[in-house]
Interface confidence: low
Amino acid sequence: GITIPRNPGCPNSEDKNFPRTVMVNLNIHNRNTNTNPKRSSDYYNRSTSPWNLHRNEDPERYPSVIWEAKCRHLGCINADGNVDYHMNSVPIQQEILVLRREPPHCPNSFRLEKILVSVGCTCVTPIVHHVA
Amino acid sequence: GITIPRNPGCPNSEDKNFPRTVMVNLNIHNRNTNTNPKRSSDYYNRSTSPWNLHRNEDPERYPSVIWEAKCRHLGCINADGNVDYHMNSVPIQQEILVLRREPPHCPNSFRLEKILVSVGCTCVTPIVHHVA
């Protein structure tokens, strides 16, 4: 790959693991004011494939709190408010980046980690396998 | 406040901005092998609230590629395959962490940023406002 042109104002890295280890400023630039999914929308209750939000807290990770969606039903809610098992509620998954303390409890050393989280659920037509 | 007890194996930080600036190892621990949402599932096509995935690329950001979901319809697909406007297709949003090069073009200096992305769509019952 090509080398990124370096800004003259870049900090130097004397770390022997460079470029694997970088400096990260933790003053987060946050464009979003609402971070609690339960307050940000009520889609989880109004959806035809409703879900519950489970809180996953890990103090050795940033973000320390991640909300995981679990679909309430195998099927989807129909117009009568009943579960229709001819349709399927499925989780929509997203790969997210987190920071993991490494070594544990170090206040200034982290490793990037990718984890898969379920963000919500959607209603899909099932794949039907016909037996010959 | 008190100083956080440091694990004896922690690297020292001589950076004048510490504790705002930390070291991050970019050798990502990835528990997931499939990172392309188009390949990970075909829910975006089979959903009653189908969506298209748009590629958002920014070389100054990590991850440089983020997929954004856009709902195809205002309504939802009914059993006949038609759009039912008595229901609404809505995006499910997730707040994710990204690294932004700061200053720009620096290979070893980043800032944490939180951004809101649409991961997929779900079908919801609309909120009806009755006029007195």
């Epitope: 103090p59 940033y62 | 956080i4």
Partner: nanobody
């Protein structure tokens, strides 16, 4: 000026109970999730429990579940930790903390209160 002052620590027999308190001042207490964290002698820092701003939800590290209870009184700007069925491994300095920059990386701490469980 933000202040967090813990109290209630002391020497207790194994199986005994203690109630830790944390008096907060200098910030809007009811706007922050609050934490209890501890450091055992020669060990790293361990998150013990946290409580939501309105007290609606509590979270505990597995080793204290069913024995410790975190609570708060927003009107009195106070945080509490009721510790029952104490074990030797609960011996530590206990700190209350507010406002994470990163988990286990708080902007304000108390001075800590020592809990010693004798067997």
């Amino acid at each position: 000026e933000v202040q967090l002052v813990e109290s209630g620590g002391g020497l207790v027999q194994r199986g005994g109970s203690l109630r830790l308190s944390c008096a907060a001042s200098g910030f809007t207490f009811s706007s922050y999730r609050m934490y209890w964290v501890r450091q055992a002698p020669g060990k790293g820092l361990e998150w013990v429990a946290s409580i939501e701003q309105d007290g609606s939800e509590e979270y505990y590290v597995d080793s204290v579940k069913g024995r410790f209870t975190i609570s708060r009184d927003n009107a009195k700007k106070s945080l509490f930790l009721q510790m029952n069925s104490l074990r030797a491994e609960d011996t530590a300095v206990y700190y209350c903390a507010k406002g994470e920059i990163l988990p286990l990386y708080f902007d304000y701490w108390g001075q800590g209160t020592l809990v010693t469980v004798s067997s």
